[in-house]
């Protein structure tokens, strides 16, 4: 019993002595935040110079305050103990840790690409000024039917399934959370529509083939014989929709 008491006292003395010797060995540990330690002077703790800070204390130098310039604006002024905090000017929003970048806002129904704000492709929507276009909810996956069609700005609204449309049932189900783009039924529907259009074109072409004069026929054949090429993008592309490719990344102004 007496031995354990002795051990506790000894440990306490050791800890207190360590604290004291730590102060003597490393006087910099006595400097608070807002100061830096200069061992070459008698008063080793000096206040941080203007436009600099130290948030921890015991530091050999003070850090230069962040300056919120250009597209950045000051949310919190720099003090001797804490760095300035920035946010973005109107029309831009913060990206990255501590708002390290400002990204341009787009309108609802658009997303930001390398070439600026682009309208959401058919079958996708964005209800915010930031972020990417997401596919509409597929109501049929939940056995529902589309009650309100989707737009570039709004997701579809799912209603009861056709089987549920009895006089008593009239509940409207909010759309399920947006799914990750993949081989969703919207894309399948899109390709079906595309195939139908192609067939119609083929039908139209065959009709033409037997009804036009030779010169006209040659001209039409020339058009269809051209190899398929991606259309060259024009500089003014505000109304072009943005179908994102995996390598596309968010644009941003770095600090």
């Amino acid at each position: 019993m007496g031995n354990s008491c002795y051990n506790i006292v000894a440990t306490l003395l050791l800890v207190l002595n360590f604290e004291r010797t730590r102060s003597l060995q490393d006087p910099c540990s006595n400097c608070p935040a807002g100061t830096f330690c200069d061992n070459n002077r008698n008063q080793i703790c000096s206040p941080c110079p203007p436009n600099s800070f130290s948030s921890a204390g015991g530091q050999r130098t003070c850090d230069i305050c962040r300056q919120c310039k250009g597209v950045f604006r000051t949310r919190k002024e720099c003090s001797s103990t804490s760095n300035a905090e920035c946010d973005c000017t109107p029309g831009f929003h913060c990206l990255g840790a501590g708002c390290s970048m400002c990204e341009q806002d787009c309108k609802q129904g658009q997303e930001l690409t390398k070439k600026g704000c682009k309208d959401c492709c058919f079958g996708t929507f964005n209800d915010q000024k930031r972020g990417i276009c997401r596919p509409w909810t597929n109501c049929s996956l939940d056995g529902k039917s589309v009650l309100v069609n989707g737009t570039k700005e709004r997701d579809v609204v799912c209603g009861p399934s056709p089987a549920d449309l009895s006089p008593g049932a009239s509940s409207v189900t909010p759309p399920a959370p947006a799914r990750e783009p993949g081989h969703s039924p919207q894309i399948i529907s899109f390709f079906l529509a595309l195939t139908s259009t192609a067939l119609l074109f083929l039908l139209f072409f065959l009709t033409l083939r037997f009804s036009v004069v030779k010169r006209g026929r040659k001209k039409l054949l020339y058009i269809f014989k051209q190899p398929f090429m991606r259309p060259v993008q024009t500089t003014q592309e505000e109304d072009g929709c943005s179908c994102r490719f995996p390598e596309e990344e968010e644009g941003g102004c770095e600090l």
């Epitope: 540990s29 006595n30 400097c31 608070p32 807002g34 008698n42 008063q43 080793i44 015991g58 003090s79």
Partner: antibody, heavy 120, light 113 residues
Framework: QVQLQQSGPQLIRPGASVKISCKAS????????IHWVKQRPGQGLEWIGM????????RLNQKFKDKATLTVDKSSTTAYMQLSSPTSEDSAVFYC?????????????WGQGTLVTVSA | DIVMTQSPSSLTVTAGEKVTMSCKSS????????????LAWYQQKPGQPPKLLIY???TRESGVPDRFTGSGSGTDFTLTISSVQTEDLAVYHC?????????FGAGTKLELK
């Protein structure tokens, strides 16, 4: 031992600037910041600002930025504080002070104080 | 600026009595890096400059009698005089020693009954 010797009491007219001194001895003058503190009769203490004698870098309390000017003369190891356009509000005892050791460890060394009376 | 609030503004005591006075800061004076609280206590007698009693909230200045004890952390601090002597009658000031501008409390006046 560390000593801070201040100039004597001053009676001045409103608007006439006043300069008070603080002579340091017994330690390395350029090694420690000199602080100035104001105390109005029967009131608390107010920190005016501080000066680094090694390079004359000053830090002033915003409240006193248009009122006090801090200077030093290294050759005579003396710190000065000048008060501009004094009013009755500036009637007070002004102290110079120095930190104990490391800095930010309390003012262990004080001058005896200089009484400034502003009166018409 | 950090505002220092002392209470009570005055205390009437008898010799030998234990006394405690409070000092509260509007912001924490605790430096997390070294676990030190940057608060100082001073004693001031009429016609004299303040005298440092306690620094870093609880470290007694050399030559200060051990009846004076500083305690507390963060924003709440206390100065205790275990057994008041007649020579202890004075005004006691607490001071933020953590960030500029350095600020003082209005003081607690210790008077004899």
């Amino acid at each position: 031992q560390v000593q801070l010797q201040q100039s004597g009491p001053q009676l001045i007219r409103p608007g006439a600037s006043v300069k008070i001194s603080c002579k340091a001895s017994g330690y390395s003058f350029t090694g420690y910041w000199i602080h100035w503190v104001k105390q109005r009769p029967g009131q608390g203490l107010e920190w005016i600002g501080m000066i680094d004698p090694s390079d004359s870098e000053t830090r002033l309390n915003q409240k006193f930025k248009d009122k006090a000017t801090l200077t030093v003369d290294k050759s005579s190891t003396t710190a000065y504080m000048q008060l501009s356009s004094p009013t009755s509000e500036d009637s007070a005892v002004f102290y110079c002070a120095r930190y104990r050791n490391y800095g930010y460890d309390g003012f262990a060394h004080w001058g005896q104080g200089t009484l400034v009376t502003v009166s018409a | 600026d950090i505002v220092m609030t002392q209470s009570p503004s005055s205390l009437t005591v008898t010799a030998g009595e234990k006394v405690t006075m409070s000092c509260k800061s509007s912001q924490s004076l605790l430096n997390s890096g070294n676990e030190k609280n940057y608060l100082a206590w001073y004693q001031q007698k009429p016609g004299q400059p303040p005298k440092l009693l306690i620094y870093w909230a609880s470290t007694r200045e050399s030559g200060v009698p051990d009846r004076f004890t500083g305690s507390g952390s963060g924003t709440d601090f206390t100065l205790t005089i275990s057994s008041v002597q007649t020579e202890d009658l004075a005004v006691y000031h607490c001071q933020n020693d953590y960030s500029l501008p350095l600020t003082f409390g209005a003081g607690t006046k210790l008077e004899l009954k």
